[in-house]
Amino acid sequence: VLEVYYTSLRCRCVQESSVFIPRRFIDRIQILPRGNGCPRKEIIVWKKNKSIVCVDPQAEWIQRMMEVLRKRSSSTLPVPVFKRKIP
């Protein structure tokens, strides 16, 4: 599940990983667009083991995965998978 959140918080990610995470270990992926106190886009992966990983948005694996999910959602769903939450 991909989620896009718009928040007024500062950057949440201190350290980012580029290591591939298999989808069976992922609960959801949260995307925080740049702006609102943080100058960069942030991607947070919530894992099924209850741990959280910040992923480098430039990491090849996450870009590839998001492209696959976008293609899949646009071809099978009438609405995009991106959920917008504005507090």
Partner: antibody, heavy 120, light 107 residues
Framework: EVQLVESGGGLVQPGGSLRLSCAAS????????MSWVRQAPGKGLEWVAE????????NYAPSLKDRFTISRDNAKNSLYLQMNSLRAEDTAVYYC?????????????WGQGTTVTVSS | DIQMTQSPSSLSASVGDRVTITCKAS??????VYWYQQKPGKAPKLLIY???YRYTGVPSRFSGSGSGTDFTFTISSLQPEDIATYYC?????????FGGGTKLEIK
């Protein structure tokens, strides 16, 4: 030091059953996915099955799932593989391995293996 | 199932040589590829994770690259202790699958 020690292998007749065990020490066993991987004599590695910490998610190699059952007992730091209706082609060294899911997402620790021989 | 086709199946090289092993996945596995070293009578050891990251304690002469379906494992300068069989594995989806292995020998 992380240690995974397999046991329970041996000689069994075709059609028989065997239960393999893997005793873990040096890791917080209850936090990790675990896998069984086997290797027939002179052959390559073949993944058998995996189980998540809560035993709520289990995945098998499709060709084995009707005969093999993976399970675990977190209180005993132990992983098991129940093998039924054994065939000659199940003859192999069976390894247990930790499926790390925090940093590497790989099979990062392996036991020394236990040998299963299916023969009449 | 995702098939991992590894080549060559065996390889003879001299100490100091650059050695390259390739692995081809039957479908896109992103960067979910891992490389293992196995010495005779021993359990496999993890060398490379996420296609290109060296595992803790692995010498810098070992490296990996690739994404999608094509992956490469390289030993930049072969050492006598590198004699072993090397396996690729995809962890993109279950069932997890391994390449057939590459047996490396010293010339």
């Amino acid at each position: 030091e992380v240690q995974l020690v397999e046991s329970g292998g041996g000689l069994v007749q075709p059609g028989g059953s065997l239960r393999l065990s893997c005793a873990a020490s040096g890791i917080d066993f209850s936090r990790y996915w675990m896998s069984w991987v086997r290797q027939a004599p002179g052959k390559g590695l073949e993944w058998v099955a995996e189980i998540n910490p809560e035993s709520s998610t289990i995945n098998y190699a499709p060709s084995l799932k009707d005969r093999f059952t993976i399970s675990r007992d977190n209180a005993k730091n132990s992983l098991y593989l129940q093998m039924n209706s054994l065939r000659a082609e199940d003859t192999a060294v069976y390894y247990c391995a930790r499926q790390e899911d925090y940093e590497y997402y790989a099979l990062d620790y392996w036991g020394q293996g236990t040998t299963v021989t299916v023969s009449s | 199932d995702i098939q991992m086709t590894q080549s060559p199946s065996s390889l003879s090289a001299s100490v100091g040589d650059r050695v390259t092993i390739t692995c081809k996945a039957s479908q896109d596995v992103n960067t979910g590829v891992y490389w293992y070293q196995q010495k005779p009578g021993k359990a496999p050891k993890l060398l490379i994770y996420s296609a290109s990251y060296r595992y803790t304690g692995v010498p810098s002469r070992f490296s990996g690259s690739g994404s999608g379906t094509d992956f490469t494992f390289t030993i930049s300068s072969l050492q006598p202790e590198d004699i072993a069989t090397y396996y690729c594995q995809q962890g993109y989806s279950t069932p997890l699958t391994f390449g057939g292995g590459t047996k490396l020998e010293i010339k």
